[in-house]
């Protein structure tokens, strides 16, 4: 059976839209009005990986684009990444680990940890216009909450 | 009154190595993004390195990516760069930044002299 | 990576003229771009973000305009404290680059 996706955008907990900061990284910036065009749609796909009630293993495609959101290591340190792959070959159910997420939902705000990396998280910062990130902590200065909002295919 | 004060500067052979640091003052020195930005002698700007207030996202140039490494002790108020594996094109004043709005710099240090040669 | 192109890369002028000097983006970088003055043995100093936002203490004779790839620092009637190199830097994605200067002789 195909893959289920939906499609979706993501904003931090402070409102930060998330878009293309050249061509294989996101950054986080407050966008208004027409700007709102420049933000990322995602292709969410439900993939294979350890379920629970409020986790759920996902793989985040930008929508029409052969790019995933990877997590890798880079100088031994976790680093998020988009990442190109073959479209004919993704979506798949059985995505590598290293595209996977486990969406977590916690008081109607999502948090997308690693499942190549668990604890670590994808993250944004509090200033403006700054890269997305994987970041290896929860409550502190980087945002790790974020909401989503649905989109129309 | 924002300061920021580069030290650690000097000669160094190629292949060496050298930790440059930078003390700051009069702001919330754990608020703020900092960069690392170089001038070679009679050159323009370039960019090193990025840290971001937490530590936990770091990018570089692709010059330096593999040889510099970026940290900071927001405890001690100070940023770091260490940089190994000198080469003489890395001959220049380093110059440390505090993050203004959006990626700009809006306030930086005096700047230290590195000189790599044999 | 972005490069960012300054011209004139040099330029004569005297006390009280007018100046324009252009920085040009290989893409687009939206909004996200800063301008610096640098005189002989000192830190650079930011002068306007964001195109056009002038930096606190700047005096109101710089300003900044344009948008997409194309923009440009004007100084409206140089004073002798104005003789200096002037550099372009986008903050769009990374790595951030600068534009490689304009330096403002006096004439």
């Known amino acids: 059976a195909p893959v289920r996706s939906l499609n979706c955008t993501l904003r931090d907990s402070q409102q930060k839209s998330l878009v293309m900061s050249g061509p294989y990284e996101l950054k986080a910036l407050h966008l208004q009005g027409q700007d709102m065009e420049q933000q990322v749609v995602f292709s969410m796909s439900f993939v294979q990986g350890e379920e629970s009630n409020d986790k759920i293993p996902v793989a985040l495609g930008l929508k029409e684009k052969n790019l995933y959101l990877s997590c890798v290591l880079k100088d031994d340190k976790p680093t998020l990444q988009l990442e190109s792959v073959d479209p004919k070959n993704y979506p798949k159910k059985k995505m590598e680990k290293r595209f996977v997420f486990n969406k977590i939902e916690i008081n109607n705000k999502l948090e997308f940890e690693s499942a190549q990396f668990p604890n670590w998280y994808i993250s944004t910062s509090q200033a403006e216009n700054m890269p997305v990130f994987l970041g290896g902590t929860k409550g502190g200065q980087d945002i790790t909450d974020f909401t989503m909002q649905f989109v129309s295919s | 009154e924002v300061q920021l004060l580069e030290s650690g500067g000097g000669l160094v052979q190629p292949g060496g190595s050298l930790r440059l640091s930078c003390a700051a003052s009069g702001f919330t020195f754990s608020k703020y993004f900092m960069f690392w930005v170089r001038q070679a002698p009679g050159k323009g700007l370039e960019w090193v390195s990025v840290?971001?207030?937490?530590?936990?996202?770091?990018r570089y140039a692709d010059s330096v990516k593999g040889r510099f490494t970026i940290s900071r002790d927001n405890s001690k108020n100070t940023l770091y760069l260490q940089m190994n594996s000198l080469r003489a094109e890395d001959t220049a004043v380093y110059y440390c930044?505090?993050?203004?709005?959006?990626?700009?710099?809006?306030?930086w240090g005096q700047g230290t002299l590195v000189t790599v040669s044999s | 990576d972005i490069q960012m192109t300054q011209s004139p890369s040099s330029v004569s002028a005297s006390v009280g003229d007018r100046l324009t000097i252009i920085c040009r983006a290989s893409q687009d970088i939206n909004r996200w771009l800063a301008w610096y003055q640098q005189t002989p043995g000192n830190a650079p100093k930011l002068l306007i973000h964001s195109v056009t936002s002038l930096q606190s203490g700047v005096p109101s004779r710089f300003s900044g305009s344009g948008s997409g790839t194309d923009f440009t620092l004007t100084i409206n009637s140089l004073q002798p404290e104005d003789f200096a190199t002037y550099y372009c830097?986008?903050?769009?994605?990374?790595?951030?680059?600068f534009g490689g200067g304009t330096k403002v002789e006096i004439k």
């Open positions: 840290i971001s207030p937490s530590g936990g996202m770091t």
């Open positions: 930044a505090r993050v203004g709005y959006g990626g700009n710099s809006d306030y």
């Open positions: 830097q986008q903050a769009d994605s990374f790595p951030l680059t």
